[in-house]
Amino acid sequence: LPAQVAFTPYAPEPGSTCRLREYYDQTAQMCCSKCSPGQHAKVFCTKTSDTVCDSCEDSTYTQLWNWVPECLSCGSRCSSDQVETQACTREQNRICTCRPGWYCALSKQEGCRLCAPLRKCRPGFGVARPGTETSDVVCKPCAPGTFSNTTSSTDICRPHQICNVVAIPGNASMDAVCTSTSPTRSMAPGAVHLPQPVSTRSQHTQPTPEPSTAPSTSFLLPMGPSPPAEGSTGD
């Protein structure tokens, strides 16, 4: 004969465990039903009655099958340097990630504890490695024949336009200026951008920074100490 299916609550056989989505209640000494995600145990089981579950209240959640007496509180609202990438529901906690232009310098189990603004590359320098969710921007000097005239965390060095006749030669922070005759090859207008970190790319993107009005001779200055390598701000 096939074994009978026991309905909760039931006393487990000695040495056996309760089935999936059940738990052993020490007080009742019975296998009882767990509550589904989005619910919690309102009344624990007894020898004769199963667990009574109830829905989580607003701003609380349970993500797993459980028998907790109270749902967990969702995390606080996302801060001004973050965007909400997962809303607080009865079944999941809110997740905040750093907004565009920022990276997570200190992670927590889900989301980010502390966001920091990405470094920017000054005129004469372009982005060598873009910022990611968890790493800062790395800049590099623009090589001969390329330039960047912006202070930006996304702009890379781009080629000088090639002129028939050069009026002003380009340098690391300025494009070449051609005489009134049109250049033989002109780059597409506007700066070349690197994408923002994937998780926030579609969220609240900010306008492209305008070119800095600072003098564009910074690349001529003697180089100071090397900037920290990517990731060196982490512990």
């Epitope: 801060s79 310098a105 502390l114 920017k120 320098f125 306008p207």
Partner: antibody, heavy 121, light 110 residues
Framework: QSVEESGGRLVTPGTPLTLTCTVS????????INWVRQAPGKGLEWIGI?????ITNFANWAKGRFTISKTSTTVDLKIASPTTEDTATYFC??????????????????WGPGTLVTVSS | ALVMTQTPASVEADVGGTVTINCQAS??????LAWYQQKPGQRPKLLIY???ILTSGVSSRFKGSGSGTEYTLTINGVQCADAATYYC????????????FGGGTEVVVK
Amino acid sequence: QSVEESGGRLVTPGTPLTLTCTVSGFSLSTYDINWVRQAPGKGLEWIGIIYTGGITNFANWAKGRFTISKTSTTVDLKIASPTTEDTATYFCARGGYDSDGYVYPDAFDPWGPGTLVTVSS
Amino acid sequence: ALVMTQTPASVEADVGGTVTINCQASESISNLLAWYQQKPGQRPKLLIYRASILTSGVSSRFKGSGSGTEYTLTINGVQCADAATYYCQHGYTGTNVQNVFGGGTEVVVK
């Protein structure tokens, strides 16, 4: 590249006051601006920041007491209802130190000379 | 709230001596820490950023170190011109910040 505060004066408690930070040599669409104050004989106290995109954030104690706004070349700090405890020198400071091809937005440089606000009845 | 605790509040040093100022964050700040010098009646001056990088024009007698929650400013070969108040500052201006600055340390040179 410089910043300079103005608008500091003697006011009576409860009289709204607006301080202005005027920037030159750089763009407010590239750099954040912080407001910091220093009561006589006391330490530096961060009030808040306006980011390049116009978003503002404030120290816990300053929320609701101050607002920050900006134009293309100025940043205003409004003290909604000053009390005698708001007597201090108010500084604006750019969020962003330029070095080695980088702008480090977490360091404050340059600073303005400060403007003195005295709140007294 | 993220809080910076700076010690000592005041320190005396002999010319040529060494001064050590400590700054403790209530949680890790991942090296996003700066040090400032302020003399009476003047604006603060940035000395060190990212915990250990000296700004241009600042004497190599100043040294920043530390990581995680513990940071230190060391002034070697103290000179009379070093008499000032020094402040640490963390680089987070997001939510739940009480003050980005430590309480300050007054350095008195004898």
